[in-house]
């Protein structure tokens, strides 16, 4: 079954995928999606790197490590629940069905804040102030209306939260590795 | 791997109640919510309610409310649906189902157990 | 509640012929949809997620799109694999609620 990592709202995400390249500098294209990886390419595309430099992103999502070295991990941004789901990394490898494609399971964690009573009211779009807590999306978020102006990151600094407090280190060998040439 | 095994449905008698479990495996339930689903024969999927085991918290589909209680078991692994009142229109099977993680879509499902309502 | 409105409630396919599910929701739902096949005699299984994200282990045959109250699941070539029932649901808000099905059945 897929890997799984976990992060909290609020917090960066962090979806290890790595290469070797062959030689220093011969980089291999690769793409990131949202959605299971398909027969070809990938769907919903966050992130795209070509032989030489990343040629195309969105917002939120980047590579954090050294993709010319074969880290191309990818980070994402300040997560929301909305962020939960598979991730596709794909090593685009020449050759006719030669790719190494990578399934990645996110899952975003409600942030637990226990301020000040709150209130649990029907979404609107029309909320002055909101912040995510345990729930599923819009239908379940509360307002922290009496709370002075703070962001997210204040809440919870904590790192990335990986499955079974695995170490960053020791993703490497979590199977999204592959070696070229 | 992730596993769903519900047990404890059967024939009961209109107005009686009903407690069915629901065995995990493969995940630590505390991790993500657990949802009960039902389907009357020959028809289609409603949701009854889900759980977050951490701590408790519940929420019912409105219909359910009074007349369903969801209920986790950590230390077993395990989720409950007790049902109550029951009648002739709860005949169904029952699915347990763990979400994605926190977010109101199945990726997982359990077998079915199967609730008649009958005298 | 929201209320989903799939169509058609059946529908027959030939192998190997594109074949197209529509789901209506009563209000605006985002991209918050989801799509399940129910083989016969099984459980329902995840096919796509948010609208247009195909779950893993799921054929690339198989596409969502939309967004507010409109959705639509393509297959663009049907197998004899894909006989069952098709369910839309939205996730948006509570109480989460299910398309009537839509079944698909080879001609």
């Known amino acids: 079954s897929e890997v799984e990592y976990r992060a909290e709202v609020g917090q960066n995400a962090y979806l290890p995928c790595f290469y070797t390249p062959a030689a220093p500098g011969n980089l291999v294209p690769v793409c990131w999606g949202k959605g299971a990886c398909p027969v070809f390419e990938c769907g919903n595309v966050v992130l795209r790197t070509d032989e030489r430099d990343v040629n195309y992103w969105t917002s939120r999502y980047w590579l954090n490590g050294d993709f010319r070295k074969g880290d191309v991990s990818l980070t994402i941004e300040n997560v929301t629940l909305a962020d939960s789901g598979i991730y596709c990394c794909r090593i685009q490898i020449p050759g006719i069905m030669n790719d190494e494609k990578f399934n990645l399971k996110l899952v975003i964690k409600p942030a637990k804040v226990t301020p000040a009573p709150t209130r649990q009211r029907d979404f609107t779009a029309a909320f002055p102030r909101m912040l995510t807590t345990r729930g599923h999306g819009p239908a379940e978020t509360q307002t922290l209306g009496s709370l002075p102006d703070i962001n997210l990151t204040q809440i919870s600094t904590l790192a990335n939260e990986l499955r079974d407090s695995r170490l960053a280190n020791d993703l490497r060998d979590s199977g999204a590795t592959i070696r070229i040439g | 791997e992730v596993q769903l095994v519900e047990s404890g449905g059967g024939l009961v008698q209109p107005g009686g109640s009903l407690r069915l479990s629901c065995a995990a495996s493969?995940?630590?339930?505390?991790?993500?919510?657990m949802h009960w689903v039902r389907q009357a024969p020959g028809k289609g999927l409603e949701w009854v309610g889900r759980?977050?085991?951490?701590?408790?918290?519940?929420k019912y589909a409105p219909k359910f409310q009074g007349k369903a209680t969801i209920s986790a078991d950590t230390s077993k692994n395990t989720a409950y649906l007790q049902m109550n009142s029951l009648r002739a229109e709860d005949t169904a099977v029952y699915y347990c189902?763990?979400?994605?993680?926190?977010?109101?879509?199945?990726?997982?499902w359990g077998q079915g157990t199967l609730v008649t309502v009958s005298s | 509640d929201i209320v989903m409105t799939q169509s058609p409630l059946s529908l027959p396919v030939t192998p190997g012929e594109p074949a197209s599910i529509s789901c209506r929701a009563s209000?605006?739902?985002?991209?918050?949809v989801a799509w399940y096949l129910q083989k016969p005699g099984q459980s329902p299984q995840l096919l796509i997620y948010?609208?247009?994200n195909r779950y893993i282990g799921v054929p690339d045959r198989f596409s969502g799109s939309g967004s507010g109250t409109d959705f639509t699941l393509k297959i663009s070539r049907v197998e004899a694999e894909d006989v069952g029932v098709y369910y839309c649901?939205?996730?948006?808000?509570?109480?989460?609620?299910f398309g009537q099905g839509t079944k698909v059945e080879i001609k």
């Open positions: 209000q605006s739902v985002d991209n918050y």
């Open positions: 493969g995940f630590n339930i505390k991790t993500t919510y």
């Open positions: 948010y609208a247009s």
């Open positions: 649901q939205q996730h948006y808000s509570s109480p989460y609620t």
């Open positions: 759980i977050d085991p951490a701590d408790d918290n519940t």
């Open positions: 189902v763990r979400d994605f993680g926190y977010v109101a879509w199945f990726a997982y």
